[in-house]
């Protein structure tokens, strides 16, 4: 660590005095201190001498000696007072800038330590300090305003009592800057805009920050727009607003608009798209297939996306039949707005009943006209089966009728013994009917098919079973010949009928 001679922490001299400060280190040494006149610097190897033969109040300050080659960065300091009866203060700065909540050091250096008891800090023109101003004083460094606030940005003077009167320093301007957390906050409204050619439009770009030093502009397709700026201050924030008013829009006004704001912390930007159209439009679409198949008893949500400008004047869901004249309950219809020009409409159909199959239409209207989107809903049913014994063209025939949706497939089984249902061990013969006769097939209804099994002689200790299946389930009917005639058995667990 360098050593300073004289080896005292502070030195008090009178104006005009000769002062010599010598610093010695192991290697070369350097002096630093406040910018002040009249010093002469002599350096010689490991020592450096600061001297003046005409000290003035402006030489008051702390002089520090460092050894640049010292890895520990040690230093030594001495404080010099040049006590001028006419100049109690040496002010080292015109202005002090700090951030809010930092300590602000106003560098009024007292030229005579004896005056310390009578010092005070005031605002210029003798005005008192603002309430809650917490400050302290150091004769070496000056006044410190602790945790400075933006509102304390003022012009200050340091005051000392000399011979019963207050002597003021020159003024120091304190600027307390707001801590800027980042680039200005931005809003650009609307987020999206559609207008018919000839209509009026407004786009508003606004930015706000705790600090007034920021810029904001609105650009259209990368061209900066010249728009008058409105400025405001509220909620402790500065606001700058740019409003673009278009009385009659045309196609050249369409495109991308960006609101850009920047400050020392960086830049923020946000964009929106402006569409100009020739006339009103109304588009309906669905991500779902318009032909829906659902198992009876299950639920379904029908969703329609609507894109429209101007806004909708009316909309509803309608049941077009064929089963009844019932209409969807309003409580089952739901509308959500994705944004200004896009909406989603949902019709919830819980626990579907047979009478609810059919066509559902969503209708919407705006100044562009009516549009409709129609869903066709078919219900799926597991097969229902029945078997009867009859004679066709003089031949004994088993006749199996199966009804369900989708169209059921039919299989005949012959098995030994009397049973409600053939199991694998009992099966004697299996016939698949690839092409059963379709008896009825109407839209939204079950499909009924008929399969014939010609039997020359009914074996009395055997069972004939008709099985039908589709993608929903299966059904069967067992036919047991008895000596008195024929006996039929539907399965024990008969199909659920909604």
């Amino acid at each position: 660590i360098p050593v300073i001679e004289p080896s005292v922490p502070e030195l008090v001299v009178k104006p005009g005095a000769t002062v010599t400060l010598r610093c010695v280190g192991n290697g070369s040494v350097e002096w630093d201190g406040p910018p002040s006149p009249h010093w002469t610097l002599y350096s010689d190897g490991s020592s450096s001498i600061l001297s003046t033969n005409n000290a003035t109040f402006q030489n008051t300050g702390t002089y520090r000696c460092t050894e640049p080659g010292d890895p520990l960065g040690g230093s030594a300091a001495i404080h010099l007072y040049v006590k001028d009866p006419a100049r109690p203060w040496n002010v080292l700065a015109q202005e002090v800038v700090v951030f809010e909540d930092q300590d602000a050091l106003l560098p009024c250096l007292l030229t005579d330590p004896v005056l310390e008891a009578g010092v005070s800090l005031v605002r210029v023109r003798g005005r008192p300090l603002m309430r809650h101003t917490n400050y302290s004083f150091s004769p070496w460094h000056g006044f410190t305003i602790h945790r400075a606030k933006f509102i304390q940005s003022q012009d200050y003077q340091c005051s000392a009592l000399m011979g019963g009167r207050k002597v003021m320093s020159i003024s120091i301007r304190l600027k307390v800057q707001k801590v800027i957390p980042g680039p200005p906050a931005l809003t650009l409204v609307p987020a999206e805009l559609v207008r018919i050619r000839g209509e009026a439009a407004q786009i508003v770009c606004s930015a706000s920050s705790v600090d007034v030093n920021f810029d904001v502009f609105l650009q259209h397709n990368n061209t900066k727009l010249a728009i008058p700026q409105q400025s405001d201050f509220h909620n402790n924030r500065y606001q700058k607003v740019l409003t673009l008013n278009l009385d009659q829009v045309d196609f050249q006004h369409a495109g991308n608009y960006s609101c850009v704001a920047s400050n020392v912390q960086g830049k923020h930007s946000t964009s929106m798209f402006f569409r100009v159209v020739e006339s009103a439009y109304l588009n309906l679409s669905s991500e779902q297939n318009l032909i829906q198949e659902v198992t009876v008893g299950e639920g379904l949500n029908l969703k329609v996306m609507v894109e429209a400008y101007p806004g909708l004047q009316g909309f509803n869901w309608t049941y077009l039949g064929p089963f009844s004249d019932h209409q969807p309950e309003p409580k089952l219809a739901n509308a959500t707005t994705k944004d200004t020009y896009r909406h989603t409409f949902t019709l919830s159909l819980p626990r579907l009943k047979p009478s609810e199959a059919g066509r559902y239409s969503f209708l919407a209207r705006n100044p562009g006209g009516w549009r409709a989107l129609t869903f066709e809903l078919t219900l799926r049913y597991p097969p229902e089966v029945s078997v009867i014994w009859t004679f066709i063209n003089g031949s004994g025939t088993l006749l199996c009728a199966a009804s369900g949706y989708p169209q059921p497939n039919v299989t005949w089984l012959q098995c030994s013994g009397h049973t409600d249902r053939c199991d694998e061990a009992q099966v004697l013969q299996v016939w698949d009917d690839p092409y059963p006769e379709v008896l009825s097939q109407e839209p939204f209804h079950k499909v009924t098919v008929q399969s014939l099994l010609t039997v020359e002689t009914l074996e009395h200790n055997q069972t004939y079973e008709c099985r039908a299946h589709n993608s929903v389930g299966s059904g069967s009917w067992a036919f047991i010949p008895i000596s008195a005639g024929a006996h039929t058995h539907p399965p024990d667990e008969f199909l659920f009928t909604p």
Epitope: E30, W31, D32, G33, P34, P35, S36, P37, H38, W39, T40, L41, L50, R64, L92, A93, Q94, E95, V96, V97, V98, Q102, A104, L105, P107
Partner: antibody
Framework: QVQLQESGPGLVKPSETLSLTCTVS????????WSWIRQPAGKGLEWIGR???????NYNPSLKSRVTMSVDTSKNQFSLKLSSVTAADTAVFYC???????????WGQGTTVTVSS | EIVLTQSPGTLSLSPGERATLSCRAS???????LAWYQQKPGQAPRLLIY???SRATGIPDRFSGSGSGTDFTLTISRLEPEDFAVYYC?????????FGGGTKVEIK
């Protein structure tokens, strides 16, 4: 070895505010004065002002009304703002360590700022 | 403010020759507060001399400074190829700090 690096936008529009930052590396910003100097193309050097690590500032009177400086010791940075710029403010801007008895002993490499619409 | 006037504006010399650059102040400058800087194209200025006559760290001894009051001189005893540049004087004793207009030392 103390090094300085200026940073900021290279293009500023007339009437806007020029903002530059100088980052000090290889040493502490504390206990020193730090100056900003500018140099228009093909011309001499002009001192803008200096700031001490505590925030004390002295400005060149010719620019004082438009200049603000600040220091952030936590980031080892000091900054310059020059408001209401015109084409005449187009220059290379330098930051430098400014020592009472040695002059400006360490300089940044400079950053060119053009004022144009 | 103190105005510094440098002369000549341009000095055309050959390598090996002696260069003498002048800096005149509009009012007295304490010799402790006069510096000389060298600037090459596209580079920042570099401190050569402080306190009118003290060489900064790493500066060759062919560079020397002298003078007091209002007249100061920078001398380059034998010009090396790397010395061809613009040289500025600066006073740092009074605010505002001021620079001279510069002297360009070019190869003849």
């Amino acid at each position: 070895q103390v090094q300085l690096q200026e940073s900021g936008p290279g293009l500023v529009k007339p009437s806007e505010t020029l903002s530059l930052t100088c980052t000090v590396s290889g040493g502490s910003i504390s206990s020193y004065y730090w100056s900003w100097i500018r140099q228009p193309a093909g011309k001499g050097l002009e001192w803008i002002g200096r700031i001490y690590s505590s925030g004390s500032i002295n400005y060149n009177p010719s620019l004082k009304s438009r200049v603000t400086m600040s220091v952030d010791t936590s980031k080892n940075q000091f900054s310059l703002k020059l408001s209401s710029v015109t084409a005449a403010d187009t220059a290379v801007f330098y930051c430098a360590r400014d020592r009472a008895f040695y002059g400006m002993d360490v300089w940044g490499q400079g950053t060119t700022v053009t004022v144009s619409s | 403010e103190i105005v510094l006037t440098q002369s000549p504006g341009t000095l055309s010399l050959s390598p090996g020759e002696r260069a003498t650059l002048s800096c005149r102040a509009s009012q007295s400058v304490s010799s402790s507060y006069l510096a000389w800087y060298q600037q090459k194209p596209g580079q920042a200025p570099r401190l050569l001399i402080y306190g009118a006559s003290s060489r900064a760290t790493g500066i060759p001894d062919r560079f020397s400074g002298s003078g007091s009051g209002t007249d100061f001189t920078l001398t380059i005893s034998r010009l090396e190829p790397e010395d061809f540049a613009v040289y500025y004087c600066q006073q740092y004793g009074n605010s505002p700090l001021t620079f001279g207009g510069g002297t360009k030392v070019e190869i003849k």
